[in-house]
């Protein structure tokens, strides 16, 4: 808190400019009125301030705004968005894009800070839902934002913003979130030729049901192992010999060198040892010849 | 780097004049902010005046109306003239350069913002 003193003769600030910075805090505090600087917020980032200075100026804005800062404000905050705390952003209802990049913008090349989550949380609530534009903009800074929020969070995501999403905006995206997301992608891209719409779901596939995969292996789509190896296991397993041939073309000669692990060692465990040595690979694990095999979650079904 | 170096200094009655210098070299574009302080003895360093990139000016309350600060860009260096002299205004006093470029400290009033200085220069003034 800054101690309440006179402002001296002649120091009292006609406009927010430069020579303030030389302004100890408490000039600040008595010799700035809160209104001029709140019209005047464009020209506060320009100046070089310390952050105890940016501590006073943020002081006087909430002695202002005590019930939130307009948009008009916000959106020229600038540094001083460094200063404010989660508490002060839930109090602000940020509607504009335009807001949101500028204050993006000052946090750049950080990690999301909890002022940053916090913003917008209250945007993406704003808006309803996660468009396209506010997609596009939150993967250009935050390529992990996609894989950050939870299905539920995901589930409000319109299809159309799917085409907002690069390849590595879903590296960190676990099954649960690919779940979410693959079926608004399969929509999204549903119009698209087989090698397009391949290129395009590819990313998503860790989301894909057997039979979308079953799809898939018509098409002569070449999935390199990479995509293959983030397949949901429980997709994988009913696939055949001769569809995982298929998916993977010319990439099927690196099942060898994942076969220890998931989903390929389960996928082996399923199939029939006759039928992997069709590959010409050396896989080995598979049901040997004469076993007869039990699909026990039939069984089970049936009781 | 930047080398700060400052001359004018000297002795002289109270009322008179005296204009400092201070020369920079070692760089092409104006530092944030140059400033002149003084340091009294036994006192702390006070900002004298203040001379931002852009050309603003400030002025301790001490020395309003009585200092002025100003720069000749081509000769990269800044002045501080020093009118109607008191005694209590002898103390060394010494020019720095700011870019602080991580916005640490108080305000540009404060000595630890401050990253580069001169030896300093005494002015005496006799009553």
């Known amino acids: 808190e800054v101690e309440k003193t006179a402002c001296p003769s002649g120091k009292k600030a006609p406009e927010i400019d430069e020579s303030l910075i030389f302004y100890k805090k408490w000039e600040l505090e008595a010799c700035v009125d809160a209104a001029l600087l709140a019209t005047q917020m464009d020209r506060v980032n320009a100046i070089p301030f310390t952050y105890e200075q940016l501590d006073v100026l943020k002081h006087k804005l909430d002695e202002l705004y005590p019930q939130g800062y307009p948009e008009s404000v916000i959106q020229h905050l600038g540094y001083l968005f460094l200063k404010m705390s989660p508490e002060d952003i839930r109090k602000w209802n940020v509607t504009s894009l335009e807001t949101l990049k500028a204050l993006l913008e000052v946090n750049k090349g950080h990690e999301m800070s909890p002022q940053v989550a916090t913003l917008i949380d209250r945007f993406v609530k704003g808006r309803g839902q996660l468009d396209k534009d506010t997609l596009d903009t939150l993967t250009a800074f935050y390529p992990g934002y996609l894989c950050s929020l939870s299905p539920e969070e995901l589930s409000s995501v319109p299809p159309s913003s799917i085409w907002a999403v690069r390849p590595q905006d879903l590296d960190t995206c676990d099954p649960r979130q690919l779940d979410v997301l693959y079926p608004k992608a399969r929509l999204a891209f549903q119009n698209m030729n087989g090698s397009e719409y391949f290129v395009k779901i590819q990313s998503f596939l860790g989301g894909a049901p057997t039979e979308d995969l079953k799809a898939l292996s018509q098409q002569n789509v070449s999935m390199d192992l990479a995509t293959f190896m983030k397949l949901r296991t429980d997709a994988v397993l009913p696939l055949t010999v001769a569809e995982v041939q298929k998916l993977l073309g010319p990439h099927v000669e690196g099942l060898k060198a994942e076969e220890r692990h998931r989903p390929v060692r389960d996928w082996i465990l399923r199939q029939r040892q006759d039928d992997l040595d069709t590959l010409g690979l050396g896989l080995q694990g598979g049901i040997p010849n004469g076993y007869l095999v039990l699909d026990l979650s039939m069984q089970e079904a049936l009781s | 780097e930047v080398q700060v170096v400052e001359s004018g200094g000297g002795l002289v009655q109270a009322g008179a004049s005296l204009r400092l210098s201070c020369a920079s070299s070692?760089?092409?574009?104006?530092?944030?902010?140059m400033a002149w302080f003084r340091q009294a003895p036994g006192k702390e360093r006070e900002l004298v005046a203040g001379?931002?990139?852009?050309?603003?000016?400030y002025y301790s309350d001490s020395v309003k109306g009585r200092f002025t600060i100003s720069r000749d860009n081509a000769k990269n260096t800044v002045y501080l003239q020093m009118d109607s002299l008191k005694f209590e205004d002898t103390a060394v006093y010494f020019c720095a350069a700011g870019d602080n470029p991580d916005r640490r400290g108080s305000s540009w009033s404060s000595s630890s913002v401050y990253e580069y200085w001169g030896q300093g220069t005494q002015v005496t003034v006799s009553s």
């Open positions: 001379l931002t990139w852009t050309g603003r000016t």
């Open positions: 070692g760089r092409t574009i104006s530092p944030i902010a």
